[in-house]
């Protein structure tokens, strides 16, 4: 029977800069029941606070609701593991909410085959940013990535769309049914999950662009 091993806070994520959650990995438990507590203070403060919510994020997590989340202050936090034989602390972790944003997937993905008379046909893809993200303030720059493939293909074709919310693809296999998805990330955050797939049938007379 031993004191617990050193825990590690390994992940913090925010869907929108208004709330965030951090997760830790326990160290070895020393063969005894072990209690974990996360304490934190914000830059410029000395007063330590305990995690406000150990439930919402699941096991080994701390969730900071709206009233506990500030974009203006860096959070300094650590996890304490305690059993009957003693305690151990994680390294201190510094968190700036701006840099942990992982948005929800983009919305309203629409895909259409366009066949203008005077130009090559193309696949037109359009989407909207996730609802929770406020792009008007300028705090966020969202970048987008599209992936598509014929229904039975193994490999995805990936296109980086930058900040635009629509995209044209010229080179497609006629007569094939394609799956299309889009995801987004802030310039200094994490990729969202892929949006639900949208299916599109490419007409047999679609002329491939070389």
């Amino acid at each position: 029977q031993l004191p617990p091993g050193k825990p590690e806070i390994f992940k913090c994520r925010s869907p929108n800069k208004e709330t965030f959650t951090c997760w830790w990995r326990p160290g070895t438990d020393g063969g005894l029941p072990t209690n974990y507590s996360l304490t934190y203070h914000r830059e410029g403060e000395t007063l330590m606070h305990e995690c406000p919510d150990y439930i919402t994020g699941g096991p080994n997590s701390c969730h900071f609701g709206k009233q506990y989340t500030s974009m203006w202050r860096t959070y300094i936090m650590m996890v304490n593991a305690t059993n009957q034989m003693g305690s151990s602390f994680s390294d201190e972790l510094y968190v700036d909410v701006t840099y942990i944003v992982q948005p929800d997937p983009p919305l309203e993905l629409a895909v259409e085959v366009k066949q203008p008379e005077d130009r090559k046909p193309y696949l037109w893809i359009k989407w909207s940013p996730p609802t929770l993200i406020d792009l008007k303030t300028g705090w966020f720059t969202l970048l987008y990535e599209i992936r598509l493939k014929p229904e039975k293909a193994a490999e995805w074709e990936i296109h980086f769309a930058g900040q635009q919310t629509e995209f044209k693809i010229l080179s497609l296999h006629p007569g094939q049914k394609y799956l299309v998805q889009v995801r987004c990330k802030p310039d200094h955050g994490y990729w969202s999950a892929w949006s639900p797939a949208t299916f599109i049938q490419i007409p047999s007379d679609f002329t491939m662009n070389d």
Partner: antibody, heavy 118, light 112 residues
Framework: EVQLVQSGAEVKKPGSSVKVSCKAS????????IHWVRQAPGQGLEWIGE????????NYNQKFKGRATLTVDRSSSTAYMELSSLRSEDTAVYYC???????????WGQGTLVTVSS | DVVMTQTPLSLSVTPGQPASISCRSS???????????LHWYLQKPGQSPQLLIY???NRFSGVPDRFSGSGSGTDFTLKISRVEAEDVGVYFC?????????FGGGTKVEIK
């Protein structure tokens, strides 16, 4: 204990390439961005770029775009910085650095001296 | 790119005396999120840089309280209230508000 251990000194010919490694230990490698900074002899510090080891997403200083390539090998918790078309002005100590969930770096490697000379 | 200008270039200080280093940026370092990402690093002789101050005025873990940072917008200052022998080295200011991140040219602090 968090450690960033870099590869040894290199001497290269002008026009060639160099690949510097930075092996991370003491933390979950995919959690934090790795930055690369260089320091020419007797000079200040110059930021080359950064990479997110979780998905290999990169941001480069435009000055180095096309000549510097940042990569990671997640299986060995190692980050790499490759610089091509070397010239004498690239002679410098190259550092890797690690951020927290922030955009400043708290941990630095010991540095790798790259000398470019004919 | 944001140009960071440090003054003075070098500083010779008697132990126990204060020291002050100035850093000026060519444009405001206030991020669109309201934070100011101006940091100070110390590079001791033969070593890698180490973080002293982050976001203008916050001491990093383990940094003695004789180090303090202040400023806003484009003008920033690092102060050492009482210089000790272990404080010798080159001090760099750095901004990470704008990409590319940039550094000042450095201020060499030595002991008289």
């Amino acid at each position: 204990e968090v450690q960033l251990v870099q590869s040894g000194a290199e001497v290269k010919k002008p026009g060639s390439s160099v690949k510097v490694s930075c092996k991370a230990s003491g933390y979950t490698f995919t959690s934090y961005w790795i930055h690369w900074v260089r320091q020419a002899p007797g000079q200040g510090l110059e930021w080359i770029g950064e990479i997110d080891p979780s998905d290999s997403y990169t941001n480069y200083n435009q000055k180095f775009k096309g000549r510097a390539t940042l990569t990671v090998d997640r299986s060995s918790s190692t980050a790499y910085m490759e610089l091509s078309s070397l010239r004498s002005e690239d002679t410098a100590v190259y550092y890797c650095g690690r951020s927290f969930f922030t955009n400043w770096f708290a941990y630095w490697g010991q540095g790798t001296l790259v000398t470019v000379s004919s | 790119d944001v140009v960071m200008t440090q003054t003075p270039l070098s500083l010779s200080v008697t132990p126990g005396q204060p020291a002050s280093i100035s850093c000026r940026s060519s444009q405001s370092l206030v991020h669109s999120n309201g934070n100011t990402y101006l940091h100070w690093y110390l590079q001791k002789p033969g070593q890698s840089p180490q973080l002293l101050i982050y976001k203008v005025s916050n001491r990093f873990s383990g940094v003695p309280d004789r180090f303090s940072g202040s400023g806003s917008g484009t003008d920033f200052t690092l102060k050492i209230s009482r210089v000790e022998a272990e404080d010798v080295g080159v001090y760099f200011c750095s901004q990470s508000t704008h990409v590319p991140f940039t550094f000042g040219g450095g201020t060499k602090v030595e002991i008289k």
